[in-house]
């Protein structure tokens, strides 16, 4: 008996071939011997089966001795043994119809779980293997689960159902709703304007929800809400904003925040959360602000950084075009009695400069002692 695998919702063509290459009488029946379709001369006739409106054949092939049964919009319950009667012969074809669906919506939040459920006919024992867009393979039976979805899981999942050494392939498009970056660091000199951007890693027709930026300043004992906003059809409207700092927010996507000036008291870490309509859970993006200040007080030239710096970073003070006078894994370095010239304060990661601030040291003229 020939086995054919079909996909729920698809169309399948079951073949039946006569030895004579001409149009002769044929009938397709199901396992209960109920006629599905056949011919009367050059006319297609249909029987009382449940497939009535979904069954068809190709008249153009009859003259070549081919009498296919075409079943459209396949259902799991179409799984059956189909019998083609032609030239006093019976050809049996076993059709097994499978369906693979995502548990809920195919738009899932980062960190959520994806469950794929296989619908299969009674008596079948299929195995399923799915390959994610990033090439990760998962195997299972009737259900497959992937916990903690990541941004790289967005895209087409290819799932292969194996039964009786035959296979059928399903493609499911999954959209992981997330920010493009989980975390970002902005390095700024004191007084500079700060731009925070929160681009989304997906596009949808209508995007509605609400969001908030909580900020934990390095110098503060607790975090506070800097801004809350609404999102309606990709339009942003501010609900509430603190007076210090007075953030500004762009009216269109991507979400964009402007801090008028970087100050040591603002250095720290923020967490932007976005709750989307009809979705449980929230999207998160961490943002960090590092602020640098170079100052000269009497005979002391100091360079300081505030904010979440990595212990791998090096802070240096150097006279322009000269070797670093001081270079340490610290958040503050200083030079006593600096010579005149343009000094550079540098925050670097393995030689890569992340932040630079220049300060001019003027020559100190010694006043002559009066006799």
């Amino acid at each position: 008996k020939k086995v054919v695998l079909g996909k729920k919702g698809d169309t399948v063509e079951l073949t039946c071939t006569a030895s004579q290459k001409k149009s002769i009488q044929f009938h397709w029946k199901n396992s209960n011997q109920i006629k599905i379709l056949g011919n009367q001369g050059s006319f297609l006739t249909k029987g009382p089966s449940k497939l009535n409106d979904r069954a068809d054949s190709r008249r153009s092939l009859w003259d070549q001795g081919n009498f296919p049964l075409i079943i459209k919009n396949l259902k799991i319950e179409d799984s059956d043994t189909y019998i083609c009667e032609v030239e006093d012969q019976k050809e049996e074809v076993q059709l097994l119809v499978f369906g693979l669906t995502a548990n809920s919506d195919t738009h899932l939040l980062q960190g959520q779980s994806l469950t794929l459920t296989l619908e299969s006919p009674p008596g079948s024992s299929p195995s399923v293997q799915c390959r994610s867009p990033r090439g990760k393979n998962i195997q299972g039976g009737k259900t497959l689960s992937v916990s903690q979805l990541e941004l790289q899981d967005s895209g087409t999942w290819t799932c292969t159902v194996l039964q009786n050494q035959k296979k059928v392939e399903f493609k499911i498009d999954i959209v992981v709703l997330a920010f493009q970056k989980a975390s970002s660091i902005v390095y700024k000199k004191e007084g500079e304007q700060v731009e925070f951007s929160f681009p989304l890693a997906f596009t949808v027709e209508k995007l509605t929800g609400s969001g908030e930026l909580w900020w934990q300043a390095e110098r503060a004992s607790s975090s506070k809400s800097w801004i809350t906003f609404d999102l309606k059809n990709k339009e942003v409207s501010v609900k509430r904003v603190t007076q210090d700092p007075k953030l500004q927010m762009g009216k269109k996507l991507p979400l964009h925040l402007t801090l008028p000036q970087a100050l040591p008291q603002y250095a720290g870490s923020g967490n932007l959360t976005l709750a989307l309509e009809a979705k449980t859970g929230k999207l998160h993006q961490e943002v960090n602000l590092v602020v640098m200040r170079a100052t000269q007080l009497q005979k002391n030239l100091t360079c300081e950084v505030w904010g979440p710096t990595s212990p791998k970073l090096m802070l240096s003070l150097k006279l322009e075009n000269k070797e670093a006078k001081v270079s340490k894994r610290e958040k503050a370095v200083w030079v006593l009695n600096p010579e005149a010239g343009m000094w550079q304060c540098l925050l670097s990661d393995s030689g890569q400069v992340l932040l630079e601030s220049n300060i001019k040291v003027l020559p100190t003229w010694s006043t002559p002692v009066q006799p």
Partner: antibody
Framework: QVQLVQSGAEVKKPGASVKVSCKAS????????ISWVRQAPGQGLEWMGI????????NYAQKFQGRVTMTRDTSTSTVYMELSSLRSEDTAVYYC????????????WGQGTMVTVSS | DIVMTQSPDSLAVSLGERATINCKSS????????????LAWYQQKPGQPPKLLIY???TRESGVPDRFSGSGSGTDFTLTISSLQAEDVAVYYC?????????FGQGTKVEIK
């Protein structure tokens, strides 16, 4: 598993230059800085400088300033160390070494390249 | 530049006994900002590149046997091999990475008595 594979041994005359290569395989090339460390026969270890493959920025030890040049080719995941005006005391094994992910100690080393300076 | 000085220059210890190597830096390698000691220990066997054993003065690199331990803070550091094995015969180096140029100690040769 990340590996650093260095070019073969070199014999050079005093005053000449040598260029040693260090090819990274099995990891993200631009994520970690590469240092060069040398070791004269029977002697200790001496740090020469560092290159950040992502931007190509360098930081050389003052002792080698003006004589050493570190470069990188991101297309081949290779860093190079060129030492000019060679003298006999530059005879040493030259190592490239990668800094750790969370620290700047050297967690992965190349096999070393022997450079002999002799007239 | 920070000068790293190791003692002793060489050490002969019986198998199974404790070996202790000291390392002194000419200035502190403890960062007050990050509360970390920027000190590493390496093992080098003949004809091989050095191998990282310890970083942050006391954090063991993955895959390094737990008989190796590091301690100390500021300017004084110690590498201890609690029970010397035949495969531990090597030269051991301390290194500071608090400031550039990164500098190494002169090395301590460990042998079996």
């Amino acid at each position: 598993q990340v590996q650093l594979v260095q070019s073969g041994a070199e014999v050079k005359k005093p005053g000449a230059s040598v260029k040693v290569s260090c090819k990274a395989s099995g990891g993200t090339f631009s994520s970690y800085a590469i240092s060069w460390v040398r070791q004269a026969p029977g002697q200790g270890l001496e740090w020469m400088g560092i290159i950040n493959p992502s931007g190509g920025s360098t930081n050389y030890a003052q002792k080698f300033q003006g004589r050493v040049t570190m470069t990188r080719d991101t297309s081949t995941s290779t860093v190079y160390m060129e030492l000019s005006s060679l003298r006999s005391e530059d005879t040493a094994v030259y190592y490239c070494a990668r800094e750790g992910r969370d620290h700047d100690a050297f967690d992965i080393w190349g096999q070393g390249t022997m450079v002999t300076v002799s007239s | 530049d920070i000068v790293m000085t190791q003692s002793p220059d060489s050490l002969a210890v019986s198998l199974g006994e404790r070996a202790t190597i000291n390392c002194k830096s000419s200035q502190s390698v403890l960062s007050s900002s990050y509360n970390k000691n920027y000190l590493a220990w390496y093992q080098q066997k003949p004809g091989q590149p050095p191998k990282l054993l310890i970083y942050w003065a006391s954090t063991r690199e993955s895959g390094v046997p737990d008989r190796f331990s590091g301690s100390g803070s500021g300017t004084d550091f110690t590498l201890t091999i609690s029970s010397l094995q035949a495969e531990d015969v090597a030269v051991y180096y301390c290194q500071q990475y608090y400031t550039t140029p990164f500098t190494f100690g002169q090395g301590t040769k460990v042998e079996i008595k």
